[in-house]
Interface confidence: low
Amino acid sequence: RSDQEPLYPVQVSSADARLMVFDKTEGTWRLLCSSRSNARVAGLSCEEMGFLRALTHSELDVRTAGANGTSGFFCVDEGRLPHTQRLLEVISVCDCPRGRFLAAICQDCGRRKLPVDRIVGGRDTSLGRWPWQVSLRYDGAHLCGGSLLSGDWVLTAAHCFPERNRVLSRWRVFAGAVAQASPHGLQLGVQAVVYHGGYLPFRDPNSEENSNDIALVHLSSPLPLTEYIQPVCLPAAGQALVDGKICTVTGWGNTQYYGQQAGVLQEARVPIISNDVCNGADFYGNQIKPKMFCAGYPEGGIDACQGDSGGPFVCEDSISRTPRWRLCGIVSWGTGCALAQKPGVYTKVSDFREWIFQAIKTHSEASGMVTQL
């Protein structure tokens, strides 16, 4: 881990699942004192770190489990807990007289389970390399990409669901393969689509404002997690995009603007471009809104394209000690494909963390097309 990438201030131990929070005043790691709100604290901690949810939580005793390099405790203000999305806002140093602290197992994400060392200028990828990538198919034809957040939730772009494509029984989610034609992939139906109510083209077809291009697809049943099917992590709370960082976009979209879709999943490494640069007159001239970002090369040549829409733009980091891939962007729009000074434009996922968590909690039983602001 480089000096530019410090550890995230909330960590979960891979050894015994203890939750640890960094005390920046003291420069030490503290344990979270057990309370009646353990379930909520575990969930919030996992979400803060970029995991989708806590799977289980438990209580450990410092006398038997040991301090393991931590010193002291944080206690949670249970009165303020229901009104926050940030654990760090509701904790303070305390004694924790019982010596019992919180452990949680978060839903794993962003890691390949195989030993593996639409995209213009990209290359074919190999099975298990991007195990969160799915294909969204309407009437059997690939229309959009998507990213698995769990076995049964896929994050994609709102624009993949115009009025003409809203018969949910005709959608399928294809996962676990890199060849569109693979007989080995798994295919599931769709129970619900939750799209962002602030995506203006759905209200006004003439709108050129593409902010909030985000949607969640709830599968009719969960995909089994295998070597080839794994969820991606979300950005951690407060984690900013790093201009110039090279990340990866994947998809089965067109390999040229007027070309055919790729039969095999493509991957391309492209750098993040600052919004200041991307809003320049020679780039997109103020069309890049705060909840979007650009990625690509000023000279063009490598980019996402039609059919990659909704697919993942992922960046790897080690802020959770273990290297993990995080879904930083969703392929949204662009002028042409791989043109000079017209990079791909992506939905900035970090700005929709709360929208995602809220949608999943609120609409897990919903059916059909659902909108959420």
Epitope: D139, S182, G185
Partner: antibody, heavy 118, light 106 residues
Framework: QVQLQQSGPELVKPGASVKVSCKAS????????INWVKQRTGQGLEWIGE????????YSNEKFKGKATLTTDKSSNTAYMQVSSLTSEDSAVYFC???????????WGQGTSVTVSS | ENVLTQSPAIMSASPGEKVTMTCSAS?????MHWYQQKSSTSPKLWIY???KLASGVPGRFSGSGSGNSYSLTIRSMEAEDVATYFC?????????FGGGTKLEIK
């Protein structure tokens, strides 16, 4: 190896129902859809519908809605198709077939002959 | 419903002869699949994703096409190729089969 073993031939009276079974082995039953296909003597193939055992989600050919009912029993790795209100038009060989990710049916049962006769 | 029309309905070829049969779709499809069925047996997946040979299929078979028009070709007819061949599309519901091409040997 992947195998789909179907139940034996049936001779049934008009107006009755018949339930054909398809026992899967050699793969994870819940990971693939099971399709059902009809073939009348000397005729072509007709897709009846498919069922995904993991969730029991079903996609059916409108033509067979109300005629064929698809179910599965995950504990025995078996798919079933019940055909009701039988007429001579339902006399056919019925196949189950495993559906792979791209809709191609890669493994087929041996077929079950259903004859409707009074 | 996407109607698949196969032609010819029946054809015969001499051993060693090149054979081509076609399948026309009323609506464009992403991929076409082909099945071989011999009398009184189950169909077998023969060609999938338009051009890929299923396991155990001899290399003299090939498939091609796009959009609405697809074909299956046998480079050099052999006696064991006598069968009925069905095209099949899975690009839209309901899934549909062609009426079949019955291939006989002269």
């Amino acid at each position: 190896q992947v195998q789909l073993q179907q139940s034996g031939p049936e001779l049934v009276k008009p107006g009755a129902s018949v339930k054909v079974s398809c026992k899967a082995s050699g793969y994870t039953f819940t990971d693939f859809v099971i399709n059902w296909v009809k073939q009348r003597t000397g005729q072509g193939l007709e897709w009846i519908g498919e069922i995904y055992p993991r969730s029991n989600s079903i996609y059916s050919n409108e033509k067979f809605k109300g005629k064929a009912t698809l179910t599965t029993d995950k504990s025995s790795n078996t798919a079933y198709m019940q055909v009701s209100s039988l007429t001579s038009e339902d006399s056919a060989v019925y196949f189950c077939a495993r559906g792979s990710g791209d809709y191609a049916m890669d493994y087929w049962g041996q077929g079950t002959s259903v004859t409707v006769s009074s | 419903e996407n109607v698949l029309t196969q032609s010819p309905a029946i054809m015969s070829a001499s051993p060693g002869e090149k054979v081509t049969m076609t399948c026309s779709a009323s609506s464009s499809v992403t991929y076409m699949h082909w099945y071989q069925q011999k009398s009184s047996t189950s169909p077998k997946l023969w060609i999938y994703d338009t051009s890929k040979l299923a396991s155990g299929v001899p290399g003299r078979f090939s498939g091609s096409g796009s959009g609405n028009s697809y074909s299956l070709t046998i480079r050099s007819m052999e006696a064991e190729d006598v069968a009925t061949y069905f095209c099949f599309q899975g690009s839209g519901f309901p899934l549909t089969f062609g009426g079949g091409t019955k291939l006989e040997i002269k």
